[in-house]
């Protein structure tokens, strides 16, 4: 999906009003020195591409993020504020339902959510490219 035509300000507002707080709740009890962010993004569409990938694509050691509250709210925000996003996700959602597993918060998931927080920071403030 090409995130170029999303309403970035509305997505930012959704993130700051609820999603950010859900991420903090998920990470509660984790030391702020524990994880080193290795995934980066250069502009808002790129950031949303990386956020979508880390939030919804199962990875080795962390298969369950898509069922977390912050993921569901992220999906809703993208569906509302990115034209045509919902249609691209129907097949992906059906595939995800087939491999539904119980929620387990692993260290790998905590690391992945730490990466997500970093990507959202850059989405909110893509200051390093002149606006």
């Amino acid at each position: 999906y090409d995130f170029t035509n999303c309403d970035f300000e509305k997505i930012k507002a959704a993130y700051l009003s609820t999603i950010s707080k859900d991420l903090i709740t998920y990470m509660s009890g984790t030391k702020s020195t524990e994880f080193n962010n290795t995934v980066s993004c250069s502009n808002r569409p790129h950031c949303l591409t990386e956020i979508q990938s880390l939030t919804f694509n199962p990875t080795a050691g962390c298969a369950s993020l898509a069922k977390e509250m912050f993921a569901m709210k992220t999906k809703a925000a993208l569906a509302i504020w990115c034209p045509g996003y919902s249609e691209t996700q129907i097949n992906a959602t059906q595939a995800m339902k087939k491999r539904r597993k119980r929620k387990v918060t692993t260290n790998k998931c905590l690391e992945q959510v730490s990466q997500l927080q970093g990507l959202w920071r850059r989405f909110n403030r893509p200051l390093l490219k002149q606006q």
């Epitope: 300000e9 962010n37 959202w120 920071r121 909110n124 200051l127």
Partner: antibody
């Protein structure tokens, strides 16, 4: 506990350079932007620029382009600002600050470094 | 550059009374406004981010509102420890810019 500790006060001659350090602790240094802000005596706050310690990317206020250089050393979790061609108007308290967890504000600030430029 | 203009420059309010500080941007900054408090001889402290979100540990008597070009910081019941200079800041466009500051004193 997140802390930003800056180097001590400096007195410099006009035309010279100054380098101020900002040592971070209590968090992963490379994960958060470091901002630099200055405050002239009795005046308000002026944003100088920002650096991403993770990759060294910077962005500067045009008013300081060519005179200010921001760098970061991940091995020591220290950010630096170097200001060249100093003039009396550069007399100010220089602050480093860290972006907050959402990327929309500066949540931790250094104690400030006073730079005095005088002949 | 986006100019942030605060009003008034200084303000004297009685203890327990409401204090209101305004901030006007020279062009729309959406909701990208932050408020800081600076006490004499100290570094600035974050109060409110993204217009109306309280930073951790900031008392409920502080609140922010507004959007576009007009923003307000309100202290609902002034306490002695609130004596300080307050700054608004926009982070919507480069360069980031601050208001000139509003000095709040006890009447």
């Amino acid at each position: 506990e997140v802390q930003l500790v800056q180097s001590g006060a400096e007195v410099k001659k006009p035309g010279s350079s100054v380098k101020v350090s900002c040592k971070a602790s209590g968090y992963t240094f490379s994960n958060y932007l470091i901002e630099w802000v200055r405050q002239a005596p009795g005046q308000g706050l002026e944003w100088i620029g920002v650096i991403d310690p993770g990759n060294g990317d910077t962005n500067y206020n045009e008013n300081f382009k060519g005179r200010a250089t921001l760098t970061a050393d991940k091995s020591t979790s220290t950010a630096y600002i170097e200001l060249s061609s100093l003039r009396s108007e550069d007399t100010a308290v220089y602050y480093c600050a860290r972006e907050d967890n959402t990327g929309t504000a500066f949540d931790y600030w250094g104690q400030g470094t006073t730079v005095t430029v005088s002949s | 550059d986006i100019v942030m203009t605060q009003s008034p420059d200084s303000l004297a309010v009685s203890l327990g009374e409401r204090a209101t500080i305004n901030c006007k941007a020279s062009q729309s900054v959406s909701s990208d406004v932050t408020w800081y408090q600076q006490k004499p001889g100290q570094s600035p402290k974050l109060l409110i981010y993204y217009v109306d979100n309280h930073y951790t540990g900031v008392p409920d008597r502080f609140s922010g509102s507004g959007s576009g070009t007009d923003f307000t910081l309100t202290i609902s019941s002034l306490q002695a420890e609130d004596v300080a200079v307050y700054y608004c800041q926009q982070h919507h466009r480069f360069p980031l810019t601050f208001g000139q500051g509003t000095k709040l004193e006890i009447k």
